[in-house]
């Protein structure tokens, strides 16, 4: 058993049929010594008396808010949550496996630049009685500070018969050094509580590996005289790190016909313009990637050829 | 470059960008085998990193690029030695089309551009690499190349910025 926060405790349980459970001793936070009784949740049934209460925690029915009273007055509370371990593996019932980039990916994170700011998100099908708490640091043995905001519900989607809820959080490294080569990864830890179930999820990454630039901005076409060719130009996204002579991007320019089956013409360039042939009813798209480190491509910025 | 002269920024930029490309193309091609149950050997923690105080940020380069260039040189020599060690020359043999050989040669090429014959910087003492167990090598190659990708990315940014802003 360990303390999650004031008056909230997590009991770690090996979860298998007829498991003995964990013996837990609760102590009433009071100077009083006698006349103390204990109840669980809303029930008025007295579970025991005395300053301490010893219980055997085996299942969710044994978890909940234990309250000690004296003469009708509440003295203190202890909320017990359960953290299940099945076959040596902690349960992951609350969050959905996003399976990208690999199985057992519950948290996904992205950064738009090297400033030390990043966003993480996760999915669940649970709509109520759900709370999240997020902590982060750089490194684990001698952690350096990363400040995270509160997790918020950022999207709702319908997936078949189920509703899926996306939560996200923004974090900022306290003393970021954008030009340095990271040697210690960022660690993100999410505590999830659904009713009386506690779970924790972690992710470890380098900012360089989660970089995904915003799409190029101000995408424009300039037809070239007496030619089917056009000059496409664009600019670095505002959110990208500066100076651009140091934090450089590379670009992919794509000409795509109306039909998905039509052959795509692609050009790769380090410049912020390119000359391509514009076909009727086609569109021109440009996306960006860090020039020197193969992290994610941005989403496409597109304009119609016409 | 030792002694304060400027490097051939444009040549360094071109070669460092080539290094980035090679480091990424070498990464999946480190051997004929799956990683399977290879142990998570922490053997690449000793590689030199370009850290915050090394002057490799735009402001630091403007103030005095020598600190940063020396750091990059140390790293290039270190990785060149690693790529020549039995981690890469031992079995499992590299795939026939593995660019590790080219990568190795390019590391040496860039380090020589930074330190021409007859000039000498203090080079960090390269730890003598003890022979690696064959079963560890695939994982070690994977980790070394991942680490090298990060190192050469910073070096390439430095040379690109130098070529754009510090070239005579």
């Amino acid at each position: 058993i360990w303390e999650l926060k004031k008056d909230v405790y997590v009991v770690e349980l090996d979860w298998y049929p007829d498991a003995p459970g964990e013996m837990v001793v609760l102590t009433c936070d009071t100077p009083e010594e006698d006349g103390i009784t204990w109840t669980l949740d809303q029930s008025s049934e007295v579970l025991g008396s005395g300053k301490t209460l010893t219980i055997q925690v085996k299942e969710f029915g044994d978890a909940g808010q234990y309250t000690c009273h004296k003469g009708g007055e509440v003295l203190s509370h202890s909320l017990l949550l359960l953290h299940k371990k099945e076959d040596g593996i902690w349960s992951t019932d609350i969050l959905k496996d996003q399976k990208e980039p690999k199985n057992k990916t519950f948290l996904r994170c992205e950064a738009k630049n090297y400033s030390g700011r990043f966003t993480c998100w996760w999915l669940t099908t649970i709509s109520t009685d759900l709370t999240f708490s997020v902590k982060s640091s750089r490194g684990s043995s001698d952690p350096q500070g990363v400040t995270c905001g509160a997790a918020t519900l950022s999207a709702e989607r319908v997936r078949g018969d189920n509703k899926e809820y996306e939560y996200s959080v923004e974090c900022q490294e306290d003393s970021a050094c954008p030009a340095a080569e990271e040697s210690l990864p960022i660690e993100v830890m999410v505590d999830a509580v659904h009713k009386l179930k506690y779970e924790n999820y972690t992710s470890s990454f380098f900012i360089r590996d989660i970089i995904k630039p915003d799409p190029p901005k101000n995408l424009q076409l300039k037809p070239l005289k007496n030619s089917r060719q056009v000059e496409v130009s664009w600019e670095y996204p505002d959110t990208w790190s500066t100076p651009h002579s140091y934090f450089s991007l590379t670009f992919c320019v794509q000409v795509q016909g109306k039909s998905k089956r039509e052959k795509k013409d692609r050009v790769f360039t380090d410049k912020t313009s390119a000359t391509v042939i514009c076909r009727k009813n086609a569109s021109i798209s440009v996306r960006a990637q860090d020039r020197y480190y193969s992290s994610s491509w941005s989403e496409w910025a597109s304009v119609p050829c016409s | 470059v030792p002694g304060g002269s400027s490097p051939a920024w444009t040549q360094c930029q071109q070669l460092s960008q080539k290094l980035c490309t090679l480091a990424w193309s070498a990464h999946p091609l480190v051997g004929h085998m799956d990683l399977r149950e290879e142990g998570d050997e922490e053997t690449t923690n000793d590689v030199p990193h370009i850290q915050c105080g090394d002057g490799c940020d735009p402001q630091g380069l403007r103030d005095n690029s020598q600190f940063c260039l020396q750091r990059i040189h140390q790293g290039l020599i270190f990785y060149e030695k690693l790529l020549g060690s039995d981690i890469f020359t031992g079995e499992p043999s590299l795939l026939p089309d593995s660019p590790v050989g080219q990568l190795h040669a390019s590391l040496l090429g860039l380090s020589q551009l930074l330190q021409p014959e007859g000039h000498h910087w203090e080079t960090q003492q390269i730890p003598s690499l003890s022979p690696s167990q064959p079963w560890q090598r695939l994982l070690l190659r994977f980790k070394i190349l991942r680490s090298l990708q990060a190192f050469v990315a910073v070096a390439a940014r430095v040379f690109a910025h130098g070529a754009a802003t510090l070239s005579p």
Epitope: - | R36, E37, G84, G101, Q133
Partner: antibody, heavy 115, light 107 residues
Framework: EVQLQQSGPELVKPGASVKMSCKAS????????IHWVKQRPGQGLEWIGY????????KYNEKFKGKATLTSDKSSSTAYMELSSLTSEDSAVYYC????????WGQGTLVTVSA | DIVMTQSPATLSVTPGDRVSLSCRAS??????LHWYQQKSPESPRLLIK???QSISGIPSRFSGSGSGSDFTLSINSVEPEDVGVYYC?????????FGSGTKLEIK
């Protein structure tokens, strides 16, 4: 074509030393380790050790430490093995091989130790 | 040291037979096992690497299987030129060790 050409047979006296060579061709000498293997007449194979010609790092079978010394010369793309304090137990064919998972072995050097 | 045990010591077969040669390691070596053929007075020749990977130029009748500590070299239709001694080798960790060999004879 990759080839490992070993030096010719040696007849040596007990207590003496012998140095044999393995000349590599058809590939970059420093790109691959060279193993040395012993085979006594009518017997199996025993690994002696290897050398990495790039940095001259060696690894020996404990059994052959003090008996075998592996060296290499980059300029001639040649690996060497010296055997010291020879006894009749050292009479054998000695092979050099480039990495186990590649089918490149020298033809062997026969060493006969006899008074 | 990892001990490699081969069985049988000698195998007498008729051309066209399918044969299996066994090799057991004293501890797990994953798939780091190589098979060699040696005909007197030649150098050993690599037949199979990493337990089951084929080698170019080696006839397809030779195949390997196994992982951990039990390995098999199979020759699915023996030819007269397959006579010789077959060695398995631990390529997993130092010191590299070879089995004592299986001698293949033609009846």
């Amino acid at each position: 074509e990759v080839q490992l050409q070993q030096s010719g047979p040696e007849l040596v006296k007990p207590g003496a030393s012998v140095k044999m060579s393995c000349k590599a061709s058809g590939y970059t000498f420093t790109s691959s380790i060279i193993h040395w293997v012993k085979q006594r007449p009518g017997q199996g194979l025993e690994w002696i050790g290897y050398i990495n010609p790039y940095d001259d790092v060696t690894k020996y079978n404990e059994k052959f430490k003090g008996k075998a010394t592996l060296t290499s010369d980059k300029s001639s793309s040649t690996a060497y093995m010296e055997l010291s304090s020879l006894t009749s137990e050292d009479s054998a064919v000695y092979y050099c091989a480039r990495r186990w998972d590649e089918s490149y072995w020298g033809q062997g050097t026969l060493v006969t130790v006899s008074a | 040291d990892i001990v490699m045990t081969q069985s049988p010591a000698t195998l007498s077969v008729t051309p066209g037979d399918r044969v299996s040669l066994s090799c057991r390691a004293s501890q797990s070596i994953s798939v780091y096992l190589h098979w060699y053929q040696q005909k007197s007075p030649e150098s050993p020749r690599l037949l199979i690497k990493y337990a089951s990977q084929s080698i170019s130029g080696i006839p397809s009748r030779f195949s390997g299987s196994g992982s951990g500590s039990d390995f098999t070299l199979s020759i699915n239709s023996v030819e007269p030129e397959d006579v010789g001694v077959y060695y398995c080798q631990n390529g997993h960790s130092f010191p590299f060790t070879f089995g004592s060999g299986t001698k293949l004879e033609i009846k």
